[in-house]
Structure formats: C-alpha cells, structure tokens
Interface confidence: medium
C-alpha cells in the first residue's frame, strides 16, 4: 500500500469513534477541468442502444437526485432504424458513493453508502450458449 | 416542497464550523443488493463501441483508485469485426462524488469533491454538418 | 415545477442589516440549491453567493464576503440572505433562483438557473 | 474570475427579423454557458442551458451554440414580445459570472 505521511496540523484524532467517523468539508470542489469538459449530449437518442433516463430522487440522500438509464430494447438499432435481436442492449454501470442522512433527519450528520447506478447503455454481441 | 422535520437525536451544531464541516461515519454502507457488477465486467471488449480502461489512482482521494473509459476506436466495430466509421464510439460521462484528503495527508479530514468520469462507450449515429 | 416567493420590499437605512427570505414549493427543498442575484437600477445580473440546501455548505462572491450570510430551513423549506452594514450601493433588486445542483450524468444538467423568485425591491436611503 | 463579454450592448431589430448575440468567456468553459431572457420588470427566465440546450417551453426561435470561449444566442424570425434584456451566464468556475446583457428592441 501507499504509505501517506501524517501531516502534523491534521485535526486531533483522539473520538472513540475515530477513524469511523471523520470531518468532511461540504462545500464541494468541482475538479471538472478543461481536459474533461462536460459535452451536453443527446446520446441516449443517437446510440445503437437508446436509453431512457429516470428520475430517482431521495431527500435523505446527497445527491437526492440520480438519473437511472434503462435500456429501450433488448437488441440493438442497425442501419434501417430497427431493432436488430442478434445484438443486445446492455446497461454500463457504475458503483458511486453517496451521502446519506444518519439518523434519518439530521442536518449535520451522514453515512457513505455505495449505490450502483445504470448510466447508459451499450450494444455488445451476445453470448451464445450452445446446447450439447 | 416536502418537509422534513429535525430529529431531536440529531448531534450538536454548536462548532463555529458548522454547518460547513460535518461527521461522515465511514462505514460504507453497500446498497447493491441482488446485484453484480461483476456481470457487465466483459461489455468493454464485446461492445461494437469497446473501451479500455485505465486506472486512475490517487492516494490522497477516497475512492484512491477510479477506473476511466476511453474508446478504443473512433467509428465502431460492425457485423463483420472492422471499424465502421460512419458510426462514432463515445464516451458516456457521469459525474459523482469523492472525498478528498484536507488538509492533505491526513487520515480524518476530508473535503467533498466532484469529478467526471468516462463509465464505457455507446455507439451513435453521428451529427452531419451540412455546409451551405 | 418549483415555484420561488420572496418577501415583500424594504427600505433600510445606511448601516442597516437586511434579511430577505425565499419559500420554495414544489419538488424536494433538499435536492436543489438556491442562489442570490442582485440587481442595481439599470444594472446587469450579480451573483452574490448559493447554498446547498442538503448541507447548508455556502458559497460567497468575494465581494460580499463577511457580510453576506446565506441559510436554508428545510423544515420550512425557505432560504434566506442576510446582509449587514447596508450603503446607498445596496439599493437594488434581490432575487432568488433555483440551481438544480443535479450531478452531471451526459444530459441532465446542473447549475442553470432554471427557477426565479420574484424579486425584492431594497432601497437603502438616509 | 472568468470574464463574459456580450455585444452588442444595443439592438434595434424589425420583427420577424433574425437577431444573433454573442458572448465571449475570458477562459474556456467548455459549455458551461447559459442564456436568460429579462423583461421590463420582470424576473429573468431562463431560455438555453449548457450553450445548446433548450428548457421545455421555450420557444424554438430560440437556439445557441458555441463552446470553449464563444458562444451565440440566435433568435430566428423575433417577435414583438421577445424585447427585453439578454445575459448570459457562466457555471464553469466560482465565482458564478453574468455578461453585461444585450438589451433587444422592436422597432
């Protein structure tokens, strides 16, 4: 592993619950930089595999709002617009942290919690089970 | 809007800090139940928009190691396994949470941080510009 | 749709403080954050500073910070500004807008500002 | 602090005529750029996000492109209640910047 030198004006350690339980900064820092810039796409319209996005929304949760791809079919689009079932749509996921109020509620209390989310689809030959 | 009333359990807000910095119990709850991520571990190379994938690993952030897409080819692939480059392989973006060490080096401080990740590639029709 | 209604015009004198408040209703009061803009007579749009309403964590322009001071009641789901030391330069339109603060995922965006209040007229008058 | 220029400041148009206005950031912004409509005594609406993006119920004469540092809000065929100012907006960076607004007039 990579060993991290302690800085000595880290805030003091000594709560019974540490290392648990730790102090986070809220005002969030957007490192969105301009080698990555974010490019408003239609791209669940366009692909071979379309999506639609749906609404999740929780208060408990940071952040309360999260938008779930579900794929449209089970195959793909080919180059005459229809579905094509030789292929298939699959959904890409993706493993994300979010914030949740611990105990329900509280303002100034949370837990991290992992939630995976579907985030688009792609298009991928299938996998052919032949039968002996 | 939806009301959310306080918890009398709620811990104390007294900290001339608050409520910039909060407690985050780091326990990580996992909420993929039923799920296996491990199943679309195999899209990237049977995708008709495959992607490598990168590892991104910064020891001052938490999650250290992020997994970045980036498209193997700039069409995709066809029925007959060749690029095919009236279609276009893109990335599909996601935004999601981080924390990061503040001040840096210390183990139980930390600063929410927002990064852009590519999750996989999709293949799209692309957007013909007709010049006049 | 999330519908944004400010308090009523003040009149404050030089020195003064000011607190206008914002009553969200509509939607989830913690998935979004609020923004103020001002506005002087036959001025442009300034943006003075927003919040996350989950956290409370607050963001200022520089210029106002130390005496700006933005808060969110979620159990009434309304969100204040506050601002002190008031001079002849504050007079102007205080609005309140909606920033949608949902995480980038390709379509869906953040940071518009897609909601507005109504507007405050504060005059600032010896 | 990212810079946003508009021009021009002034526009006396005829209606049914096309209007262009441009913004120009400091720094690139990708295409975080966003475009409001104000009326006399009104609150500004909102009427393209993220430089290309139209909200539902915005009218389709209204449209914008650009990316990186210029941008344009192009409004095909105006109408009498289209008069009003025009500001664009940029999230990329804190702090949150508007340019100067462009005010539009009917002739």
């Known amino acids: 592993g990579i060993t991290i030198p302690r800085n000595p004006g880290c805030p003091n350690s000594e709560d019974k619950n540490f290392p648990r339980t730790v102090m986070v900064n809220l005002n969030i820092h957007n490192r969105n930089t301009n080698t990555n810039p974010k490019r408003s796409s239609d791209y669940y319209n366009r692909s071979t595999s379309p999506w639609n996005l749906h609404r999740n929304e929780d208060p408990e949760r940071y952040p309360s709002v999260i938008w779930e791809a579900k794929c449209r079919h089970l195959g793909c689009i080919n180059a005459d617009g229809n579905v094509d079932y030789h292929m298939n749509s699959v959904p890409i996921q993706q493993e994300i942290l979010v914030l949740r109020r611990e105990p329900p509620h509280c303002p100034n209390s949370f837990r991290l919690e992992k939630i995976l989310v579907s985030v688009g689809c792609t298009c991928v030959t299938p996998i052919v089970h032949h039968v002996a | 809007g939806i009301t959310i009333p306080r918890n009398p359990g709620c811990p104390n807000s007294e900290d001339k800090n608050f409520p910039r910095t909060v407690m985050v119990n780091l326990n990580i709850h996992n909420r993929n139940t039923n799920t296996n991520p491990k199943r679309s571990s195999d899209y990237y190379n049977r995708s008709t928009s495959p992607w490598n994938l990168h590892r991104n690993e910064d020891p001052e952030r938490y999650p250290s190691v992020i997994w970045e897409a980036k498209c193997r080819h700039l069409g995709c692939i066809n029925a007959d396994g060749n690029v095919d480059y009236h279609m276009n392989s893109v990335p599909i973006q996601q935004e999601i949470l981080v924390l990061r060490r503040e001040p840096p080096h210390c183990p139980n401080s930390f600063r929410l941080e927002k990064i852009l990740v590519s999750v996989g590639c999709t293949c799209v029709t692309p957007i013909v510009h007709h010049v006049a | 749709e999330v519908q944004l209604v400010q308090s009523g015009a003040e009149v404050k004198k030089p020195g003064e403080s000011l607190k206008i408040s914002c009553k969200a209703s509509g939607g989830s009061f913690s998935s979004y954050g609020i923004v103020w803009v001002r506005q002087a007579p036959g001025q442009g749009l300034e943006w003075m500073g927003g919040i996350t309403t989950f956290f409370g964590a607050t963001d200022y322009a520089q210029k106002f910070q130390g005496r700006v001071t933005i808060t969110a009641d979620e159990s009434t789901t309304t969100a204040y500004m506050e601002l002190s030391g008031l001079t002849s330069d504050d007079t102007a339109v205080y609005y309140c807008a909606r920033d949608p603060n949902e995480f980038w995922n390709g379509y869906y965006d953040t940071h518009d500002f897609d909601s507005w209040g109504q507007g405050t007229t504060v005059t600032v008058s010896s | 602090e990212i810079v946003l220029t508009q021009s021009p400041d002034f526009q006396s148009v005829t209606p049914k005529e096309k209007v262009t206005i441009t913004c120009r950031a400091s720094q690139n912004i990708g295409e975080e750029l966003h475009w409001y409509q104000q009326k006399p005594d009104q609150s500004p609406k909102l009427l393209i996000k993220y430089a290309s993006s139209s909200p539902s119920g915005v009218p389709s004469r209204f449209s914008g492109s650009g990316s990186g540092t210029d941008f344009t809000l192009t409004i095909n065929g105006l109408e009498a209640e289209d008069a009003g100012t025009y500001y664009c907006?940029?999230?990329?960076?804190?702090?949150?910047?508007f340019g100067p607004g462009t005010k539009v007039d009917i002739k």
């Open positions: 907006h940029q999230s990329f960076s804190l702090p949150v910047t």
